[in-house]
C-alpha cells in the first residue's frame, strides 16, 4: 500500500479541491448554508472541519470535509466545537471556503505545510 502523503502534497491537494468547488461558481454553495467563521491560526484545520461538518446534504463539500479530517489529529463530529474558540459570526459556506483557500495558499507559499 502507498506510504503517507507528504504534508506539502496533502496541502496542495486540499487547495486544488477548494479551487474546484469555487471556480466560476455563482450559485450559492450548499444552498447558501451559514457556518461559524473561524480564526485562521493554530488549530485552523480542526476548527474548519468542526464548522463545515455541521453542513449536511451538500455533496460539493464532502471531499473537502474528508480531506480536512486528514489534517485534524482528533475525530470531529457534528455539534463539536472544541477548536472553535470564537463562535460569534456566521458566514456563507462560499465565503468560508474562499477565506480558507486564500489562507492555505499563503501557508503553501510560506512553506508551512503542517
Amino acid at each position: 500500500s502507498p506510504g503517507p502523503v507528504p504534508p506539502s502534497t496533502a496541502l496542495r491537494e486540499l487547495i486544488e479541491e477548494l479551487v474546484n468547488i469555487t471556480q466560476n461558481q455563482k450559485a450559492p454553495l450548499c444552498n447558501g448554508s451559514m457556518v461559524w467563521s473561524i480564526n485562521l491560526t493554530a488549530g485552523m484545520y480542526c476548527a474548519a472541519l468542526e464548522s463545515l461538518i455541521n453542513v449536511s446534504g451538500c455533496s460539493a463539500i464532502e471531499k473537502t470535509q474528508r480531506m480536512l479530517s486528514g489534517f485534524c489529529p482528533h475525530k470531529v463530529s457534528a455539534g463539536q466545537f472544541s477548536s472553535l474558540h470564537v463562535r460569534d459570526t456566521k458566514i456563507e459556506v462560499a465565503q468560508f471556503v474562499k477565506d480558507l483557500l486564500l489562507h492555505l495558499k499563503k501557508l503553501f507559499r510560506e512553506g508551512r505545510f503542517n
Epitope: 487547495i15 486544488e16 479551487v19 471556480q23 466560476n24 461558481q25 455563482k26 495558499k105 507559499r109
Partner: antibody
Framework: EVQLVESGGGLVKPGGSLRLSCAAS????????MSWVRQAPGKGLEWVGR??????????NYAAPVKGRFTISRDDSKNTLYLQMNSLKTEDTAVYYC?????????????????WGQGTTVTVSS | SYELTQPPSVSVSPGQTARITCSGD??????AYWYQQKSGQAPVLVIY???KRPSGIPERFSGSSSGTMATLTISGAQVEDEADYYC???????????FGGGTKLTVLG
C-alpha cells in the same frame, strides 16, 4: 504593462507538429491561470485549453477536438506558456491566442481571460 | 459537449440600445463573460462575472443574467461599438471553457 506575445506559428503539413510559445510580462505569471484560444479564418473563437497555476494544482483541461493531440505546459521560471501541437489537421488552421485566465486567482477573484496576445497564425496545408 | 447560443447578428441605429443574448444550460450556476472583437484585432473583455465592467470599458456596456440566459446591453450604441461579440462561460464542472458562436453587431451609421 501586462503583455502576452505569441510566437511559433507557421505553415505545416497535415500530420505534422508545431510548438507555440507565449511570453508573458508585467504580472506574476506563476499566479495566473493561462488559456489558449483559437480562431479559424472567418469563424468564431474556440477555447482550446487551460492550465492552472501550480499552487492551484497545475491542472490542465482541453477541448474535445484537440485532446490527445495538443499539450499545454508552462515554465514559470521563464514566464512562458507553451502549446505543443501534434498530428495536425487542416481544421487546426487558425490564429492562436494565449490569454491570462484569472490573473487575480491568488486573491480569490475571477476576471475571465482579461489579457490577450495578438495571436500567431498556424496554417495546416499540404 | 456544452454549448452557448447567440444570435448571429444584431443591428441598431446610433444612440439606440443593443441587446445581445447568450443561452446555456449551466448559466444559472456559472458566470458569463463578454468579449468584443473588432476586425483583425484580439478580443477585449467588456463584462466579467455576468455584470462587472473592467476598468476602461465605457459605462454604456452592461451585463445581466437570469436563469439560462445572459445578456450584454449597450445603451446608446455608437459606431465604434460595431464588432463581433462573444459570450464565454464554463460547463457545469467549471473545467472546460466554451464560447458562444458570436454576434455581429452592426451600428447603422
Amino acid at each position: 504593462e501586462v503583455q502576452l506575445v505569441e510566437s511559433g506559428g507557421g505553415l505545416v503539413k497535415p500530420g505534422g507538429s508545431l510548438r507555440l510559445s507565449c511570453a508573458a510580462s508585467g504580472f506574476t505569471f506563476s499566479n495566473a491561470w493561462m488559456s489558449w484560444v483559437r480562431q479559424a479564418p472567418g469563424k468564431g473563437l474556440e477555447w482550446v485549453g487551460r492550465i492552472r497555476s501550480k499552487i492551484d494544482g497545475g491542472t490542465i483541461n482541453y477541448a474535445a477536438p484537440v485532446k490527445g493531440r495538443f499539450t499545454i505546459s508552462r515554465d514559470d521560471s521563464k514566464n512562458t506558456l507553451y502549446l505543443q501541437m501534434n498530428s495536425l489537421k487542416t481544421e487546426d488552421t487558425a490564429v492562436y491566442y494565449c490569454a491570462t485566465d484569472q490573473v487575480g486567482a491568488y486573491y480569490g477573484d475571477y476576471y475571465g481571460m482579461d489579457v490577450w496576445g495578438q495571436g500567431t497564425t498556424v496554417t495546416v496545408s499540404s | 459537449s456544452y454549448e452557448l447560443t447567440q444570435p448571429p447578428s444584431v443591428s441598431v441605429s446610433p444612440g439606440q440600445t443593443a441587446r445581445i443574448t447568450c443561452s446555456g444550460d449551466a448559466l444559472p450556476e456559472k458566470y458569463a463573460y463578454w468579449y468584443q472583437q473588432k476586425s483583425g484585432q484580439a478580443p477585449v473583455l467588456v463584462i466579467y462575472e455576468d455584470t462587472k465592467r473592467p476598468s476602461g470599458i465605457p459605462e454604456r456596456f452592461s451585463g445581466s443574467s437570469s436563469g439560462t440566459m445572459a445578456t450584454l446591453t449597450i445603451s446608446g450604441a455608437q459606431v465604434e461599438d460595431e464588432a463581433d461579440y462573444y459570450c464565454y462561460s464554463t460547463d457545469s464542472s467549471g473545467n472546460h471553457g466554451v464560447f458562444g458562436g458570436g454576434t455581429k453587431l452592426t451600428v447603422l451609421g
